[in-house]
């Protein structure tokens, strides 16, 4: 979509084990009300309140890992748009299904 990005980043995914998987609530931030973002959660994809990022435009060191395989989803959601939206040393990289925050590989 041509819309500008919503502020903040998705909250970190809880490490709890999922007992019941939920059908996805959204496919992009723009299908979420207000400031909420479309985010991966323990048991599916939900509209969640974002958390702030200190410097969203900063590029982080390292390279994005190469991804293999084909995404079976039409218009997969992006869970980030730039490195600064990712926690710690994680980078915003294109994966098999949309962009997400992943550990970089050494350049």
């Amino acid at each position: 979509s041509g819309k500008s990005f919503k502020a903040g980043v998705c909250p970190p995914k809880k490490s709890a084990q999922c007992l019941r998987y939920k059908k996805p609530e959204c496919q992009s931030d723009w299908q979420c009300p207000g400031k909420k973002r479309c985010c991966p959660d323990t048991c599916g994809i939900k509209c969640l309140d974002p958390v702030d990022t200190p410097n969203p435009t900063r590029r982080k060191p390292g390279k994005c890992p190469v991804t293999y395989g084909q995404c079976l989803m039409l218009n997969p959601p992006n869970f980030c748009e730039m490195d600064g939206q990712c926690k710690r040393d994680l980078k915003c990289c294109m994966g098999m299904c949309g962009k997400s925050c992943v550990s970089p590989v050494k350049a």
Partner: antibody, heavy 122, light 108 residues
Framework: QVQLQESGPGLVKPSQTLSLTCTVS??????????WSWIRQHPGKGLEWIGY???????YYNPSLKSRVTISVDTSKNQFSLKLSSVTAADTAVFYC??????????????WGQGTLVTVSS | EIVMTQSPATLSVSPGERATLSCRAS??????LAWYQQKPGQAPRLLIY???TRATGIPARFSGSGSGTEFTLTISSLQSEDFAVYYC??????????FGQGTKVEIK
């Protein structure tokens, strides 16, 4: 018991916006636990899922219709609505509203409205 | 999107006989498959979900089986009220949810 009832104009002119409302009784949309869908059936044809909305207002649309579809919810009236823009004769169909559980193990659409025929014609 | 293909398009069966309807998915949908019955001028009615679980109030003569890409709906002994169109629908992984084109069960 749970009931869904579609309402809206039965005739829409080409290039205009089709607007339908589904009124739900017997269960509160705002209590959560369900996705509320719109599904259409072209005359003498099969079924096409348009999209769904959650009580919070989050939506998921069929990519084939995404650019023209808006689904909204009014929990105070226990209603959800469909808007389909830039309609053509190919959008003539019976439109159903339906309910499905939010979890995969709850399966398909367990309650449906009776359907309303919308004809696109000048 | 996942394409659902039903066969046959029309099934002619005598009352009291068994009817077997098939549904094939273009890729695996696990057990996330539902079956519906639709009569003329009516909305579809949920018969089976999770590929094999009967919905509330559905008679035991309706049964579903299969997983992955191949599914079957069996009506063990057709009653007069069972003559209708039957649709399968997948709800696996990501929307869009998709339906088969339908199988019409008619009186032989």
């Amino acid at each position: 018991q749970v009931q869904l009832q579609e309402s809206g104009p039965g005739l829409v002119k080409p290039s205009q916006t089709l607007s339908l409302t589904c009124t739900v009784s017997g269960v509160s949309i705002s209590s959560g636990g369900y996705y509320w869908s719109w599904i259409r059936q072209h005359p003498g044809k099969g079924l096409e899922w348009i999209g769904y909305i959650y009580y919070s207002g989050s939506t998921y649309y069929n990519p084939s219709l995404k650019s023209r579809v808006t689904i909204s919810v009014d929990t105070s009236k226990n209603q959800f609505s469909l808007k389909l823009s830039s309609v053509t004769a190919a959008d003539t169909a019976v439109f159903y509203c339906a309910r499905e559980g939010e979890y995969y193990d709850e399966g398909g659409f367990d309650y449906w409205g009776q359907g309303t025929l919308v004809t696109v014609s000048s | 999107e996942i394409v659902m293909t039903q066969s046959p398009a029309t099934l002619s069966v005598s009352p009291g006989e068994r009817a077997t309807l098939s549904c094939r998915a273009s890729q695996s949908v696990s057990s996330n498959l539902a079956w519906y019955q639709q009569k003329p001028g009516q909305a579809p009615r949920l018969l089976i979900y999770g590929a094999s679980t009967r919905a509330t109030g559905i008679p035991a003569r309706f049964s579903g089986s299969g997983s992955g890409t191949e599914f079957t709906l069996t009506i063990s002994s057709l009653q007069s009220e069972d003559f209708a169109v039957y649709y399968c629908q997948q709800y696996n992984n990501w929307p869009p949810w998709t339906f088969g084109q339908g199988t019409k069960v008619e009186i032989k």
